[in-house]
């Protein structure tokens, strides 16, 4: 039970992370002008990772897309790379995630099969959520820097005569939209994780068939080389993971934690 | 055709307060912002200040803070410039302007009301 | 406040000729955003209000001749009338509509010779 709940939150939770990701993405406002301490302008700057908008004081908003790739600063572009990777992974890690789920049935899945793809999904969003974590990151270190940049150089001019006021920019809500949504894609990865070690088949190495011979006791053990993989330690209770291959034996007598030889 | 309608002139005495008043006609009143300019008599324009019908937002010049007030009625489509301890220095003409919705330039403008403060 | 400067401040001109009017900002009216200007140009005729002619430094007002001709950039900007016309005797203001508070330039008043 609480395995089920610890996936289908950690499904939920990546699910909105991933949203998140998506819209801040999209936002046009990961940067926007500078308000404090700036001379008031009628007309109010921002910048998203696709187009920069112009809003005049009467409402009125024009966006211009950024039309050129090879004219882009390529920290913009590694921005936009990591985004897109994180959505693409957040993507497929939903698609994956949704066969996991312990509360939908698929044909006879087995659950060692929804505990690796629970694993697998559980993975791909936490590198998802790291993407946008490091692609918002990147971002705001970069306009960190073009902060100060321009700060030091707020006014140049012909021998302080005419003056030209630049344009700062501060972080905007894309930001701070990215990485809450990456923190959550990041959360829902380690719940799917930790989901993942609880859908594993409780399984012992001793998966025993008695054959009571005459005089002394033989175990066989079926399994091929899984029951000796110790290597020299302790494996009484190991739990073995086998991906769901068994014997014919196995599939009729499913042996208990109580079966010893 | 867009009509900001004004009084023709406000005679008034040094220290009194006037209220100048722009009904706009012909347009959705609370989407554009509504401005005030000074112009004194052969001299130049002076910007004092605009407001937004829809939320009375507004923007004073520092030169005419505590001078003029901004106000309007939506009901009746109205903007009010009050104008308040006058002096000689504020004889002039005052126009009102509709703000365009493109850029911050002045579309439209009334045909001013010419304030005369004497004794 | 922004200081716009209009010359000449008087201009004796004859029906027919070439007009050419300069207004200079004491900043930078350009905005990086969009990469536009925002100067206004104003026509005043005696008597009556402003009207509007040009805004962002060289878009036309629909309805105004095309023989107005806003161009410039940053802090250096003209007006061009190409062929004067009686009807265009007025006096010309420039605006600063980037900063707060907004500011008029002293004008170019034509007069006929």
């Known amino acids: 039970m609480a395995v089920t709940a610890c996936q289908g939150l950690g499904f939920v939770v990546s699910l909105i992370g991933i949203a998140g990701i998506i819209a801040a993405t999209c936002m046009d406002q990961w940067s926007t002008q500078d308000l404090y301490n700036n001379p008031v302008t009628a007309v109010f700057n921002y910048q998203g990772l696709w187009r920069s908008c112009v809003r005049e004081s009467s409402g009125f908003t024009e966006c211009r897309g950024y039309f050129t790739l090879l004219g882009l600063p390529a920290m913009l572009q590694a921005v936009r790379a990591l985004m897109i990777v994180g959505i693409v992974l957040g993507a497929i890690g939903l698609l994956v995630s949704i066969f996991a789920l312990k509360c939908i049935r698929i044909g006879s899945m087995e659950d060692s099969a929804k505990a690796n793809m629970t694993l697998t999904s559980g993975i791909m969003f936490i590198v998802s959520g790291l993407c946008a974590i490091a692609g918002v990151s990147v971002f705001a270190n970069m306009l960190v820097t073009n902060f100060w940049m321009s700060t030091a150089n707020m006014y140049t001019g012909m021998g302080g005569m005419v003056q030209t006021v630049q344009t700062r920019y501060t972080f905007g809500a894309a930001l701070f939209v990215g990485w809450v949504a990456g923190g959550l894609t990041l959360i829902g990865g380690v719940m799917m994780c930790i989901a993942c070690r609880g859908l594993a088949p409780e399984e012992t190495n001793y998966k025993a068939v008695s054959y009571h011979a005459s005089g002394h006791s033989v175990a066989y053990k079926p399994g091929g080389f899984k029951a000796s993989t110790g290597f020299g330690s302790n494996t009484k209770n190991k739990k073995i993971y086998d991906g769901g291959a068994r014997t014919e034996d196995e599939v009729q007598s499913y042996p208990s934690k109580h079966d010893y030889v | 055709q867009v009509l900001l309608q004004q009084p023709g002139t406000e005679l008034v005495k040094p220290g009194a307060s006037v209220k100048v008043s722009c009904k706009a006609s012909a347009y959705t009143f609370t989407s554009y912002w509504i401005h005030w300019v000074k112009q004194r008599p052969g001299q130049g324009l002076e910007w004092i200040g605009r407001?937004?019908?829809?939320?009375?937002?507004?923007t004073y010049n520092q030169n005419f803070k505590g001078k003029a007030t901004l106000t309007v009625d939506k009901s009746s489509d109205t903007a009010y410039m009050q104008l308040t301890s006058l002096t000689s220095e504020d004889s002039a003409v005052y126009y009102c302007?509709?703000?365009?919705?493109?850029?911050?330039?002045?579309?439209?403008w009334g045909q001013g009301s010419l304030v005369t403060v004497s004794a | 406040d922004i200081v716009m400067t209009q010359s000449p401040s008087s201009l004796t001109v004859t029906a027919g000729e070439k007009v050419t009017m300069s207004c200079k900002s004491s900043q930078s009216l350009l905005n990086g955003g969009n990469q536009k200007n925002y100067l206004t140009w104003y026509q005043q005729k005696p008597g009556q209000p402003p009207k509007l002619l040009i805004y962002?430094?060289?878009t036309r007002e629909s309805g105004v001749p095309d023989r107005f001709t806003g161009s410039g950039s940053g802090t250096d900007f003209t007006l061009t009338i190409s062929t004067m016309q009686a009807e265009d005797l007025a006096v010309y203001y420039c605006q600063n509509d980037y900063f707060f508070p907004y500011t008029f330039g002293g004008g170019t008043k034509l007069e006929i010779k």
């Open positions: 407001i937004r019908p829809s939320d009375s937002d507004s």
């Open positions: 302007s509709m703000g365009a919705y493109y850029s911050n330039s002045f579309g439209y």
């Open positions: 962002w430094a060289s």
